[in-house]
């Protein structure tokens, strides 16, 4: 059974992930972002189901494309280089979902824009955090 300390650690990691995703979303939605139109043409794949930490596998598989989209944005929109930002997110996602569990992600039929994609995973983080508190 998860201990209170492991639950707290999970909560902190989710909060960190949530902040990173919100920061990316804010940077993309910046009214001075000249690449927004092109960024919105990138297709992102959404999970059919995202209710447990293991479902973060679906997020992990989209982090490569997410890095490429962030490479289009002006670096001043973000505190870190896209490579470093995604690297940080990968570490958090890996710790949350575990590296040993090989969960096969199932994707929804409809693709999403980067904004819809980020909002979906922000909602996921908020939902899991609320169950832990």
């Amino acid at each position: 059974a998860p201990t209170s300390s492991s639950t707290k650690k999970t909560q902190l990691q989710l909060e960190h992930l949530l902040l990173d995703l919100q920061m990316i979303l804010n940077g993309i939605n910046n009214y001075k972002n000249p690449k927004l139109t092109r960024m919105l043409t990138f297709k992102f794949y959404m999970p059919k189901k995202a209710t447990e930490l293991k479902h973060l596998q679906c997020l992990e598989e989209e982090l490569g494309p997410l890095e490429e989209v962030l490479n289009l944005a002006q670096s001043k929109n973000f505190h870190l280089r896209p490579r470093d930002l995604i690297s940080n997110i990968r570490v958090i996602v890996l710790e949350l979902k575990g590296s040993e569990t090989t969960f096969m992600c199932e994707y929804a039929d409809e693709t999403a824009t980067i904004v819809e994609f980020l909002n979906r995973w922000i909602t996921f983080c908020q939902s899991i955090i609320s169950t832990l508190t």
């Epitope: 043409t41 794949y45 490569g64 494309p65 490429e68 989209v69 490479n71 096969m104 994707y107």
Partner: antibody
């Protein structure tokens, strides 16, 4: 169906420069990140680098930096790979290949390939 | 750089047999791995992407699996046209790297 057609074989002297082309047909080049991969005779595959033709941003493998230049001409839907200071170890078949984030998940991988261009470096 | 180690270097089997090719990553790469088939004088052809997904037009006898940093390409029943060289490739981070290849030859 997307097709990549590369320029013909080249024979170069050591120290020279070679420029290979890769023409995209069936779609616009700006929908793809154009990558270059090489294969020395009887050897494995080695990633050289890539260009985003939409904004000309490039990424190169460390061991090619300073010698390789990847460019793209969106008016002709053609990508180019230029390698300078050629040496005998650069003798290889050079391939262009694509990645895109605009279509299916499968096309995020090296799904389309050119036929290859043999570059021979010999004195 | 991420190193991919393929084994065996050469695999000698007969048509109808099952082939199991291995690719081990030097670090965690998630599912960012694909498999390619290459025949002499031809460009590589995408077989499997995202570790387990079958590329379009590829026969169902090809399949991919993953356990941690170990990846496997399985050909359930070899056809004569399957004898070729197979490469794995990681897309987790640049520089993208390939395994050194496994040559599948007729016994």
């Amino acid at each position: 169906q997307v097709q990549l057609v590369q320029s013909g074989a080249e024979v170069k002297k050591p120290g020279a420069t070679v420029k290979i082309s890769c023409k995209v047909s069936g779609d616009t080049i700006t929908a793809y990140y154009m990558h270059w991969v090489r294969q020395a005779p009887g050897q494995g595959l080695e990633w050289i680098g890539r260009i985003d033709p939409d904004d000309d941003s490039t990424k190169y493998a460390e061991n090619f930096k300073g010698r390789v230049t990847i460019t793209a001409d969106t008016s002709t839907d053609t990508a180019y790979m230029e390698l300078s200071s050629l040496r005998s170890e650069d003798t290889a078949v050079y391939y262009c290949t694509t990645i895109t984030f605009y279509y299916s998940r499968e096309l995020r991988w090296f799904a389309y390939w050119g036929q290859g261009t043999l570059v021979t470096v010999s004195s | 750089d991420i190193v991919l180690t393929q084994s065996p270097a050469t695999l000698s089997l007969s048509p109808g047999e099952r082939a199991t090719l291995s690719c081990q990553a030097s670090q965690y790469i998630g599912n960012y791995l694909s498999w390619y088939q290459q025949k002499p004088g031809q460009a590589p052809r995408l077989l499997i992407y995202s570790a387990t997904s079958l590329a379009s037009g590829i026969p169902a006898r090809f399949s991919g699996s993953r356990s941690g940093t170990d990846f496997t390409l399985t050909i359930s029943s070899l056809e004569p046209e399957d004898f070729a060289v197979y490469y794995c490739l990681q897309h987790y981070s640049t520089p993208y790297t390939f395994g050194q290849g496994t040559k599948l030859e007729i016994k």
